[in-house]
């Protein structure tokens, strides 16, 4: 393989790797293709010592525009020769390559979580798996957003060991009878943009203060 | 053959900014990222910081983080690197490099950033 | 941050002599990949630094064999078996097992 060569054409591929619920997502987006593939092909070789493109095996002839390849990059040093085929039948459509480097080029979406309610807390619960390879930690730190009446609380929680196994966060101190809102998303040591969840809300039922009032009308 | 093009030296006033660039040629420009690296007499070489020339994203030297601030341009095929409130103690040889994952490979010709009043 | 450390700062050799250069890291520069990334630079008066040894014993392509690199952990060996002329230059290791990289302060080979 040629990487080296100086006549480049605007790839056809928009490329993004992902940390999705701790695996390596690479996921891809085609510009300009008149002709939608009815399958792919992702194939992949290492940099440092190019061999011939190894075939992923759950990634051959897949219908998906993403590949999990979790167990197959497991190095944040070394620099992934990838190359995507794009197929219609037995017609190959395009052909796309990119390098990719994890530590960084990794983007970090946020965990899986719920919310509960009670009177003046509510207990975030974060869905993480429950084995994290060492090298998918990235030096992450989860961080939850408290949000209510235009005011914004962030709460950086203090995980002991690695991010494995659900993880149980309580907010406390806050006052019944309020809409509050929350989000959650995993912060990288460097300055980079974190992909925030989707807000889950909760109106916290009323104390006791207001129910005996409320029953004394 | 792969080369990385430097912008020419900088001679400034203490306080001020400063943004120097590089220009790589010859290779797939995004499927290289782009490293900073500081030569001072005093220092000797020191790691800056390096940038995805794909996505951006950025990974500093804690020590250079609030003064160096590394961007890209994709369409020129350039990374930039801006200095901000210069001192004397920035005066030195900045080099950029490309690197495949933790393989630095190719240096830049280095930009000479003088800071003088 | 790891501190590379170098000796010796300036080293004084006849030509066709052999040369050793000592690099010192203060952690183990061996990553959880199985590989070690510690690496040698030459830069030569008045150029920019060149690649010259990677993952602590490759050579950098168009590097003639009379340089080898050895080492392991902590503690790692630049060798010229006979120095040339073209060897004159400052030489550094620097490492990128653990961000931020980190550089040696430099070798100065002088021919006598």
């Known amino acids: 393989i040629s990487y080296d060569s100086p006549d480049y054409t605007d790839e056809s591929c928009t490329f993004k790797i992902s940390l999705r619920n701790f695996r390596s997502i690479l996921s891809w987006e085609l510009k300009n293709h008149s002709i939608v593939p009815t399958h792919y092909t992702l194939l992949y070789t290492i940099m440092s010592k190019p061999e011939d493109l190894k075939v992923v095996k759950n990634c051959a002839n897949t219908t998906r525009s993403f590949c999990d390849l979790t167990d197959e990059w497991r190095s944040t040093h070394e620099a992934y020769v990838t190359v995507l085929e794009g197929f219609s039948g037995n017609t190959t459509l395009f052909s796309c390559s990119h390098n990719f480097w994890l530590a960084i080029d990794m983007s970090f979406e946020p965990p899986e979580f719920e919310i509960v309610g009670f009177t003046n807390h509510i207990n975030v619960m974060v869905k993480f798996p429950s084995i994290v390879e060492e090298e998918l930690q990235f030096d992450l730190s989860l961080v939850i957003e408290e949000q209510s009446e235009g005011i914004v609380k962030k709460h950086k929680p203090e995980i002991k060991g690695n991010m494995s196994g659900n993880f149980t966060y309580i907010i406390d101190k806050l006052i019944p009878n309020t809409n509050y809102c929350v989000s959650v998303y995993l912060e990288h040591s460097d300055e980079q943009a974190v992909i925030k969840s989707p807000l889950k809300c909760t109106l916290l039922p009323p104390g006791q203060e207001s129910e005996s009032a409320e029953s004394a009308k | 053959e792969v080369q990385l093009q430097q912008s020419g030296p900088e001679l400034v006033r203490p306080g001020v900014s400063v943004k120097i660039s590089c220009k790589g040629s010859?290779?797939?420009?995004?499927?290289?990222?782009m490293h900073w690296v500081k030569q001072s007499h005093a220092k000797s070489l020191e790691w800056i910081g390096v940038?995805?020339?794909?996505?951006?994203?950025?990974k500093y030297n804690q020590k250079f983080k609030g003064k160096a601030t590394m961007t890209v341009d994709k369409s020129s095929s350039t990374a930039y690197m801006e200095l901000a409130r210069l001192t004397s103690e920035d005066s030195a040889v900045y080099y950029c490099a490309r690197s495949y994952g933790s393989y630095l490979d190719y240096w830049g010709q280095g930009t000479s950033v003088t800071v003088s009043s | 941050d790891i501190v590379m450390t170098q000796t010796p700062l300036t080293l004084s050799v006849t030509i066709g002599q052999p040369a050793s250069i000592s690099c010192k890291s203060s952690?183990?520069?061996?990553?959880?990949?199985?590989?070690?990334?510690l690496n040698w630079l030459l830069q030569r008066p008045g150029q920019s630094p060149k690649r010259l040894i990677y993952?602590?014993?490759k050579l950098d392509s168009g590097v003639p064999d009379r340089f080898t690199g050895s080492g392991s952990g902590t503690d790692f060996t630049l060798k010229i078996s006979r120095v040339e002329a073209e060897d004159l230059g400052v030489y550094y290791c620097?490492?990128?097992?653990?961000?931020?990289?980190?550089f040696g302060g430099g070798t100065k080979l002088e021919i006598k």
């Open positions: 620097w490492q990128g097992t653990h961000f931020p990289w980190t």
């Open positions: 940038i995805s020339t794909y996505y951006g994203n950025v």
């Open positions: 993952l602590v014993s």
């Open positions: 952690q183990s520069l061996l990553d959880s990949d199985g590989k070690t990334y």
């Open positions: 010859s290779y797939k420009f995004t499927d290289y990222a």
